[in-house]
């Protein structure tokens, strides 16, 4: 059995109340594909949502989050409060990262500092709430005889001043 509605173009619907002729989507509705028997209601960007793209007869509205919030989920289905760097969002609001953790973004959770010793390296720059530690070369890299891009400076004997 052939679908008599299959050729109704996007932006229209196949109107069963009018003998299956194509009718335009009513205001505030859309159909993004052809052959639809109904049009979908346009998404409304209200409250913490703001409109990024208006609804048209062939495509849904697209939302963003207002300032101080960021999108979560497919097609920005939720807005979550921003926090400062060095914080994470909890049920009680934004909280500072615990010692030994950091967050360098306005969203997400605090993550543990890198454990430099796991890679046999030393801590070159200490971590903060906002930044991870910076690992330096391993102690072995600093020992005499280790290959290096620049040769080590010659050792001076005690009591001798530079020439």
């Amino acid at each position: 059995l052939q679908d008599l509605c299959s050729n109704c173009p996007a932006g229209t619907f196949c109107d069963n109340n009018r003998s299956q002729i194509c009718s335009p989507c009513p205001p505030n509705s859309f159909s993004s594909a052809g052959g639809q028997r109904t049009c979908d209601i346009c998404r409304q960007c209200k409250g913490v949502f703001k409109t990024r793209k208006e609804c048209s007869s062939t495509s849904n509205a697209e939302c963003d989050c207002i300032s101080g919030y960021h999108c979560l989920g497919a097609e920005c289905s939720m807005c979550e409060q921003d926090c400062k760097q060095g914080q994470e969002l909890t049920k009680k609001g934004c909280k500072d990262c615990c010692f030994g953790t950091f967050n360098d973004q306005k969203r997400g959770i605090c993550r543990p500092w890198t454990n430099c010793s796991l890679d046999g390296k030393s801590v070159l720059v200490n971590g903060t709430k906002e930044r991870d530690v910076v690992c330096g070369p391993s102690p072995a890299d600093l020992s005499p005889g280790a290959s290096s891009a620049t040769p080590p400076a010659p050792a001076r004997e005690p009591g001798h001043s530079p020439q």
Epitope: L4, C8, P9, Q20, I21, C22, G35
Partner: nanobody, 118 residues
Framework: QVQLQESGGGLVQPGGSLRLSCAVS????????MGWYRQAPGKRREFLAA???????VYAVSVKGRFTISRDNAKNTVYLQMNSLKPEDTAIYYC???????????????WGQGTQVT
Amino acid sequence: QVQLQESGGGLVQPGGSLRLSCAVSGFSFSINAMGWYRQAPGKRREFLAAIDSGRNTVYAVSVKGRFTISRDNAKNTVYLQMNSLKPEDTAIYYCGLLKGNRVVSPSVAYWGQGTQVT
């Protein structure tokens, strides 16, 4: 409500030409397919030509090359240009609003009243 009104029929000599018009109202013309049909005395109604919203056309073998269907969306009108007319073209000619913008295996949702071609 949906209305379709044919005009342009009349008496014509063999080999002559006629242009039929079908003015429509009561629906969104530009997004729907339209068709032309005819019914000769004592015969079944016969499909002649159809045109969809994208101006794709389909013709019956009996009229292909002689008849041309076209549409003017600004005027909400569909036309049938008939050339090299023959005595067997005598019939009442009807325009039809087709279901679902289909020109392949079309099905008519609404008919006009018809215009006589002799």
